[in-house]
Amino acid sequence: TALSPTPTTMTFTPAPLEETTTRPEFCKWPCECPQSPPRCPLGVSLITDGCECCKICAQQLGDNCTEAAICDPHRGLYCDYSGDRPRYAIGVCAQVVGVGCVLDGVRYTNGESFQPNCRYNCTCIDGTVGCTPLCLSPRPPRLWCRQPRHVRVPGQCCEQWVCDDDARRPRQTALLDTRAFAASGAVEQRYENCIAYTSPWSPCSTTCGLGISTRISNVNARCWPEQESRLCNLRPCDVDIQLHIKAGKKCLAVYQPEEATNFTLAGCVSTRTYRPKYCGVCTDNRCCIPYKSKTISVDFQCPEGPGFSRQVLWINACFCNLSCRNPNDIFADLESYPDFEEIAN
């Protein structure tokens, strides 16, 4: 199948369900990264940490994991925090097999999402509840704010960043007028001076098999930077694409299997079949990366209980004109490549 069974909890930021319990902060702002990324053992992904800061070697099966040190996404691993109640701070990388969960006496089916309180959205994956915060705490506004503080706002669920030197903030042009959101009752405040921003999708977290790609966008009711994620699979790990390169050619930029198949994820199966295209390989020193792509929504049906949908990278064409440097991270120098522009929508 095109997507190996693996949960989307691979990028969830672990969060406590008990709001009163203190828990260590694994992410520091601003980011502090070593000058050069680590060298990972063969077969271990070099990925961006859960803080969206530094390159790390992904944690493997049985390794400890945190919101910063995340498990290898393309090996179908997720961070099991069940042994660290009630803090849910340090977990162990575990493999998905796809069973249900019980939390506070309530049974949830594998793949089911629910909200235990206003601050977290949780998903049951293989007997373990993985949670992602609804109160996203992006980095403080570093450009203009010299004294940011994280405070609890009366009457609101989520804490907010406030700036003690608010008067120094430059006035911004109203490029995204969120009055339309306000009219629909989606927001409590009006954010009229909001510059709409959506970052490009990050490169897929792995060069073969299932990975994760993320981006930051403030195109939402609160004009608040939020992380979006999508599943990605640049090429299957178990197919030798070089065997498919035509005689006389150096590359096969796009590999497309003959038959359509269902995507599978955490034991759940897509409601329709797909015949995806994958990026291929070259025999010379070039790497193939997505060039023309889009994001599609794939609906999954689970054996027991409700289904769910996930955003998935859909590749239409790949570009093969970058030199391959680090076998673990072929996309490290992508942004500096002048002719490359992925279509990201």
């Epitope: 590359c251 990026c279 291929g280």
Partner: antibody, heavy 121, light 108 residues
Framework: EVQLVQSGAEVKRSGASVKVSCKLS????????IHWVRQAPGKGLEWMGG????????VYGDKFKGRVTVTEDPSTDTAYMDLKRLTFEDTAIYYC??????????????WGQGTLVTVSS | VIWMTQSPSSVSASVGDTVTITCRAS??????LAWYQQKPGKAPKLLIY???SLHSGVPSRFSGSGSGTYFTLTISSLQPEDFATYYC??????????FGQGTKVEIK
């Protein structure tokens, strides 16, 4: 229905450059590629260049290498063809045409109306 | 480079006639061949791809056949709107993609 609308006719001096645009509607550059074909007055069709889906790179006809640059702007679904160091032999109608991004399918499904480039002294 | 040679370079025919145009490739291209129609002052239009598949909206009086190095385009029961120049194009996986020199179908 896929439509390609090209920029207007150009008169250029010998040695100058010309940039022709081609705006796609009815589809997106995510699903197909734009290639460029030219036709000198009273002559046949001559392929110039475009994105080769199988090789994963923009390829050019030998005759035009180093002189032509083909680019695509996905945000506006517009493609461009930039031809440098024009000579009188470059006087021609320049067409953009679509190729579906499907392996082994190098057929030009839809064509722009053409842009006449005249090179004068 | 694969060279394409069309014959004849021009043909005179009447409405209702059947016209056959041939195209030879300098080396084998399997069935990777397309035929285009071009009228004066207009852009070419795709008629047939894959040597024999009719492009959408093309009348069934147009048909194509052949493989390897020898291909034909047949227009049965020629209509007034069919008087034009026809080009073959090799569409194998290797650039450059080359066209034949064209065959002009004229009114007799």
């Amino acid at each position: 229905e896929v439509q390609l609308v090209q920029s207007g006719a150009e008169v250029k001096r010998s040695g100058a450059s010309v940039k022709v645009s081609c705006k796609l509607s009815g589809d997106t550059l995510t699903d197909l590629s734009i290639h460029w074909v030219r036709q000198a007055p009273g002559k046949g069709l001559e392929w110039m260049g475009g994105f080769d889906f199988e090789d994963g790179e923009i390829v050019y006809g030998d005759k035009f290498k180093g002189r032509v640059t083909v680019t695509e702007d996905p945000s506006t679904d517009t493609a461009y063809m930039d031809l440098k160091r024009l000579t009188f032999e470059d006087t021609a109608i320049y067409y953009c045409a679509t190729i579906k991004d499907i392996p082994g399918r190098y057929y030009f499904d839809f064509w722009g109306q053409g842009t006449l480039v005249t090179v004068s002294s | 480079v694969i060279w394409m040679t069309q014959s004849p370079s021009s043909v005179s025919a009447s409405v209702g006639d059947t016209v056959t145009i041939t195209c030879r490739a300098s080396q084998g291209i399997r069935s990777w061949l397309a035929w285009y129609q071009q009228k004066p002052g207009k852009a070419p239009k795709l008629l047939i791809y894959g040597a024999s598949s009719l492009h959408s909206g093309v009348p069934s009086r147009f048909s194509g056949s052949g493989s390897g190095t020898y291909f034909t385009l047949t227009i049965s029961s020629l209509q007034p709107e069919d008087f034009a120049t026809y080009y073959c194009q090799q569409a194998d996986s290797f650039p450059p993609w080359t066209f034949g020199q064209g065959t002009k179908v004229e009114i007799k």
